[in-house]
């Protein structure tokens, strides 16, 4: 399955929008910094077959979409930017979903790397618990926004590597 060129453009647009969503200076939130232990090995395109990598990407985008679809998120961000960001993520999900469905339909496709899916899920669990612990404070959201920018950058790089493999 080849992801459309519009997919990587959408990824870049999502990153730009997330960058624009920042409301407070990151420097005022230095005391709130947290290591969420991003599962970097899951973004190593060499580790997986393409079908597995796409499943991991889908999980990453889906969890990001869910995180920014909560009521707490709506209260934290400027509404029009948040809606545009969510729309970009939704489009990416559709692209990835079509690819995963296509791969599922292909016989002999290796089983999904379940530990990679779990690693992504656990990463977002750590982010969710951090927000709860910090009572969804503006600084907590700023730290999370910066972290998601990081993870989306990893996703973009993985997609580039997948395209080079084709």
């Amino acid at each position: 399955c080849d992801l459309p060129q519009t997919h990587s453009l959408g990824n870049r647009r999502a990153l730009i929008l997330l960058g624009q969503m920042g409301r407070i200076s990151p420097f005022s939130c230095l005391k709130d910094r947290h290591d969420f232990r991003i599962p970097q090995e899951e973004f190593d395109g060499n580790q997986f077959q393409k079908a597995q990598a796409i499943s991991v990407l889908h999980e990453m985008i889906q969890q990001t979409f869910n995180l920014f679809s909560t009521e707490d998120s709506s209260a934290a961000w400027e509404q029009s930017l948040l809606e545009k960001f969510s729309t970009e993520l939704y489009q990416q999900l559709n692209d990835l979903e079509a690819c995963v469905i296509q791969e599922v339909g292909v016989e002999e496709t290796p089983l999904m790397n379940e530990d990679s899916i779990l690693a992504v899920r656990k990463y977002f669990q750590r982010i969710t618990l951090y927000l709860i612990e910090r009572k969804y404070s503006p600084c907590a959201w700023e730290v999370v926004r910066a972290e998601i920018m990081r993870s989306l950058s990893f996703s973009t790089n993985l997609q580039k590597r997948l395209r080079r493999k084709d």
């Epitope: 499943s55 889908h58 999980e59 889906q62 969890q63 979409f65 869910n66 679809s69 999900l93 990835l96 979903e97 995963v100 469905i101 599922v104 999904m112 379940e114 530990d115 779990l118 899920r121 656990k122 977002f124 669990q125 750590r126 969710t128 618990l129 709860i132």
Partner: antibody, heavy 119, light 108 residues
Framework: QVQLVQSGAEVKKPGASVKVSCKAS????????MHWVRQAPGQGLEWMGE????????IYAQKFQGRVTMTRDTSTSTVYMELSSLRSEDTAVYYC????????????WGQGTLVTVSS | EIVLTQSPATLSLSPGERATLSCSAG???????LYWYQQKPGQAPRLLIY???NLASGIPARFSGSGSGTDFTLTISSLEPEDFAVYYC?????????FGQGTKLEIK
């Protein structure tokens, strides 16, 4: 509000298959993995596997691999769990439970479906 | 597979008393992925505590959770009549996800 409504009780003969459904409402169906958990009479809870309704990929517990098939129908927001080669030990209440994160993990359950396997 | 062993299997106490339920894991479980559920006869399980010590929505403050590594505890500070049920610990730290065999809390 989130609701998971399961199909009714079933009685099956050993060797047969059963297909249990779980209809979701009150949230975006494709956003959350759906899990299946079973409970034999007077026994504890046992995780069987999960399905991502968005693309249909599944993760099964090794114990059920080859005998269980989880599918979904996005048009009706319904997931299905089919168990084949039934034996008496499969007599249990089968639950669907929605995934999520933090306080949303298994926060929503179906009402359960009793499957009785008897000759 | 991470085996969760709950003790005691049955706990007989009176309303007003303190209940301490244990869950021991066969190998280390990150506290973020250890949950507790309550189940009453004929009902589906109900989420009580998530990530070892956080109270789920609508759960009274008499319930609390603690622990780390391989030993986790659910405590009910002062039992109410509606607390008599079966309690399960659950982990999703690694596949396959597992539950303890349950502790039945019954009225003495």
């Amino acid at each position: 509000q989130v609701q998971l409504v399961q199909s009714g009780a079933e009685v099956k003969k050993p060797g047969a298959s059963v297909k249990v459904s779980c209809k979701a409402s009150g949230y975006t169906f494709t956003n959350y993995w759906m899990h299946w958990v079973r409970q034999a009479p007077g026994q504890g809870l046992e995780w069987m596997g999960e399905i991502n309704p968005s693309h249909g990929r599944t993760i099964y517990a090794q114990k059920f691999q080859g005998r269980v098939t989880m599918t979904r129908d996005t048009s009706t927001s319904t997931v299905y769990m089919e168990l084949s080669s039934l034996r008496s030990e499969d007599t249990a209440v089968y639950y669907c439970a929605r995934g999520g994160l933090g306080p949303a993990w298994f926060a929503y359950w179906g009402q359960g479906t009793l499957v009785t396997v008897s000759s | 597979e991470i085996v969760l062993t709950q003790s005691p299997a049955t706990l007989s106490l009176s309303p007003g008393e303190r209940a301490t339920l244990s869950c021991s894991a066969g190998s280390s479980v990150d506290s973020s992925y250890l949950y507790w559920y309550q189940q009453k006869p004929g009902q589906a399980p109900r989420l009580l505590i998530y990530s070892t010590s956080n109270l789920a929505s609508g759960i009274p403050a008499r319930f609390s959770g603690s622990g780390s590594g391989t030993d986790f505890t659910l405590t009910i500070s002062s039992l109410e009549p509606e607390d008599f049920a079966v309690y399960y610990c659950h982990q999703w730290s690694s596949y396959p996800f597992t539950f303890g065999q349950g502790t039945k809390l019954e009225i003495k």
